[in-house]
């Protein structure tokens, strides 16, 4: 199946809030775009 980045982000933000309130943990951010350049990418959208 496919993974929707926005769904993951929404879920992550929920967990981030929960971590802060329940466990006094601070999660700054997770970058979904910090990836190496895809030299193996193929043509097509």
């Amino acid at each position: 199946g496919t993974i929707n980045v926005h769904d993951v982000e929404t879920q992550f933000n929920q967990y981030k809030t929960e971590a802060a309130s329940r466990y006094n943990l601070t999660i700054s951010d997770v970058s979904v775009s910090d990836v190496p350049f895809p030299f193996s990418a193929q043509s097509g959208a």
Partner: antibody, heavy 122, light 106 residues
């Protein structure tokens, strides 16, 4: 609306240094790779550097490697290009296009600024 | 380094005519991008990954090709299409741009 505004260009002597900045707005800066591309007067475009969205992955051609350093500040949204040991052949208009790629796709440099002129001359 | 050669260097055509621009690579690449640069302006992405129209680009532009030979076609030239066109490969580093094709009014 996506906007990219380059600044910091000017006249510098050979061997000198210059730092270019690129102010980005209208999109989530940290989600996109960014690049610098230059164009000498009357010449073709030349790729200078690329940095990933989070700043971990950085690429340069041999022509600038060891002299130029790309960096970004995702909290304030600027992209930088530190240029040292400048040569006459570095004279060009420098652009900072947004780089739209991901783990397995490359959609090209989809937005460009107006450019800033760097002149290296004694 | 992969060198991209564009031909012809200059294409002299009239509005309404069809333009065919080619980009040849010294070795095989997976895909290319095409950019347009009007006089005194910044480049603009036209086509990405060989054949996909970038946002806001009219359907008269199309791209095709594979391996080491790629083509940009403008089905019917409009006055604003007279510009310089560059291809770009990013299959291997360093990323390189083509020599450019200038489309001028005949």
């Amino acid at each position: 609306e996506v906007q990219l505004v380059e600044s910091g260009g000017g006249l510098v002597k050979p061997g000198g240094s210059l730092r270019l900045s690129c102010a980005a707005s209208g999109f989530t800066f940290s989600r996109y790779g960014m690049s610098w591309v230059r164009q000498a007067p009357g010449k073709r475009l030349e790729w200078v550097s690329t940095i990933s969205g989070g700043g971990t992955y950085i690429y340069y051609p041999d022509s600038v490697k060891g002299r130029f350093t790309i960096s970004r500040d995702n909290a304030k949204n600027p992209l930088y290009l530190q240029m040292n040991s400048l040569r006459a052949e570095d004279t060009a208009v420098y652009y900072c296009p947004r780089d739209n790629y991901g783990r397995n796709y490359d959609y090209g440099m989809d937005y460009w600024g107006q450019g800033t002129l760097v002149t290296v001359s004694s | 380094e992969i060198v991209l050669t564009q031909s012809p260097a200059t294409l002299s055509l009239s509005p309404g005519e069809r333009a065919t621009l080619t980009c040849s690579a010294t070795s095989s690449v997976s895909y290319i991008h095409w950019y347009q640069q009007r006089p005194g302006q910044s480049p603009r992405l036209l086509i990405y990954s060989t054949s996909n129209l970038a946002s806001g680009i009219p359907a008269r532009f199309s791209g095709s090709g594979s391996g080491s030979d790629y083509t940009l076609t403008i089905s019917s030239l409009e006055p604003e299409d007279f510009a310089v066109y560059y291809c770009q490969q990013r299959s291997s580093s360093p990323f390189t741009f083509g020599s450019g094709t200038k489309v001028e009014i005949k």
